[in-house]
């Protein structure tokens, strides 16, 4: 005969464990139901009554099956240098990531605690290593024969144009200037860009108009200009 299915609460067989989505209550000494994500235990089980679950209160969440007495508080609203890539719901915490042009200087378990602006390489310097979601731009001086005339977190050093007759020789921050006769070889006009890290935007559309100039409390304060490293500018 098949074993009878026990309904919570029930006393487990000696040496056995409770089933999936159940927990052992030390006080009642019974296997009791866990609460589903988005809920918490309002009333713990007894020998005769199962766990009573309730929905998480506003701005709190539980992500897992649980028997916690209170849901966890969602993180602070994202600061102005961040985008909300996951909204606070009953089942998930808010996740803030850095907006384009910024990188995460101090990460947390999910998302970013503190964003900082990507370093901009000043004229005479180009991007040696582009910024990522978690690392800053690295600048390098433009080697002989190359230049960068921009202050940018994406522009690399570009080769000088080659002139038949040079009017003004190029340097690290300026292209060569040719005499009216056209150069034999010229780079395509316009700066060469490196791809910027892209922050993934949330699929969740929140009805609130998110204040665009609202730095959040807690640790989510926007960082000021980064101290200029060699060949970089803090602007």
């Amino acid at each position: 005969l098949p074993a009878q299915v026990a309904f919570t609460p029930y006393a487990p067989e000696p040496g056995s464990t409770c089933r999936l989505r159940e927990y052992y209550d030390q006080t009642a000494q019974m296997c009791c139901s866990k609460c589903s994500p988005g809920q918490h235990a309002k009333v713990f089980c007894t020998k005769t009554s199962d766990t009573v679950c309730d929905s998480c209160e506003d701005s709190t969440y539980t992500q897992l099956w649980n028997w916690v007495p209170e849901c966890l508080s969602c993180g602070s609203r994202c600061s102005s240098d961040q985008v909300e890539t996951q909204a606070c719901t009953r089942e998930q915490n808010r996740i803030c990531t850095c907006r384009p042009g910024w990188y995460c200087a101090l990460s947390k378990q999910e998302g970013c605690r503190l964003c900082a602006p990507l370093r901009k390489c000043r004229p005479g310097f180009g991007v040696a290593r582009p910024g990522t979601e978690t690392s800053d731009v690295v600048c390098k001086p433009c080697a002989p024969g190359t230049f960068s005339n921009t202050t940018s977190s994406t522009d690399i050093c570009r080769p000088h144009q080659i002139c038949n007759v040079v009017a003004i020789p190029g340097n690290a921050s300026m292209d060569a200037v040719c005499t009216s006769t056209s150069p034999t070889r010229s780079m395509a006009p316009g700066a060469v860009h490196l791809p910027q890290p892209v922050s993934t935007r949330s699929q969740h559309t929140q009805p609130t108009p998110e204040p665009s100039t609202a730095p959040s409390t807690s640790f989510l304060l926007p960082m000021g200009p980064s101290p200029p490293a060699e060949g970089s500018t803090g602007d």
Partner: antibody, heavy 120, light 108 residues
Framework: QVQLVQSGAEVKKPGASVKVSCKAS????????MHWVRQAPGQGLEWIGR????????KHDPKFQDRVTMTSDTSTNTVYMELSSLRSEDTAVYYC?????????????WGQGTLVTVSS | DIQMTQSPSSLSASVGDRVTITCTAS???????LHWYQQKPGSSPKLWIY???NLPSGVPSRFSGSGSGTDFTLTISSLQPEDFATYYC?????????FGQGTKVEIK
């Protein structure tokens, strides 16, 4: 754009009931709460209660325990607040306001208010 | 219930003055759950500062908020004619959610 439009002014006798409506537009009623707040003439703001329009779950100040009923009609995006056993001290402007889930109760949009006068 | 007490209840100030309004809670309130509203006569309240120190879009940067625990402050760095109004603090930390009695900022 987000709008909360409330029903018109009411004059009621003591002991009667009043039902105020608040029609929401410009946003999804999911993941928001609708609150009711009142303001007696020349007085401050007093929170009455709130409803989750998606589930109908309500919470209110215990002082209104037996007199307030909050309901929602998701088909018309309208919430209602009914106050019974009216007395003269219930004379006030009644506001509906919304707070998105996860915004720690910040009420970012308010209705224009409904004046309820209780007079014999 | 958490009682919210604002001081002063009213104040008279001139354009350009620095104005500070305080809000004291009868028990501790998490900073995320403390908000301020501005209300002008005949109008509905407007969310003015959320989560203690954050300004919704459209609120001038001369407004700031600070505080923690039981003591919170709204400051106007340089009072402007359009700032004359009543300001309410509001806690959403524990139900029933409560408002301060309001601080009326009047022209001197």
């Amino acid at each position: 754009q987000v709008q909360l439009v409330q029903s018109g002014a009411e004059v009621k006798k003591p002991g009667a009931s009043v039902k105020v409506s608040c029609k929401a537009s410009g946003f999804n009623n999911k993941d928001i709460y609708m609150h009711w707040v009142r303001q007696a003439p020349g007085q401050g703001l007093e929170w009455i209660g709130r409803i989750d329009p998606a589930t109908g779950n309500t919470k209110h100040d215990p002082k209104f325990q037996d007199r307030v009923t909050m309901t929602s009609d998701t088909s018309t995006n309208t919430v209602y607040m009914e106050l019974s056993s009216l007395r003269s001290e219930d004379t006030a402007v009644y506001y509906c306001a919304r707070s998105p889930y996860g915004d720690f109760g910040a009420m970012d949009y308010w209705g224009q208010g409904t004046l309820v006068t209780v007079s014999s | 219930d958490i009682q919210m007490t604002q001081s002063p209840s009213s104040l008279s100030a001139s354009v350009g003055d620095r104005v500070t309004i305080t809000c004291t809670a009868s028990s501790s309130v998490s900073s995320n759950y403390l908000h301020w509203y501005q209300q002008k006569p005949g109008s509905s309240p407007k969310l003015w500062i959320y989560s203690t120190s954050n300004l919704p879009s459209g609120v001038p940067s001369r407004f700031s908020g600070s505080g923690s625990g039981t003591d919170f402050t709204l400051t106007i760095s340089s009072l402007q004619p359009e700032d004359f109004a009543t300001y309410y603090c509001h806690q959403y930390h524990r139900s029933p959610w409560t408002f301060g009695q309001g601080t009326k900022v009047e022209i001197k």
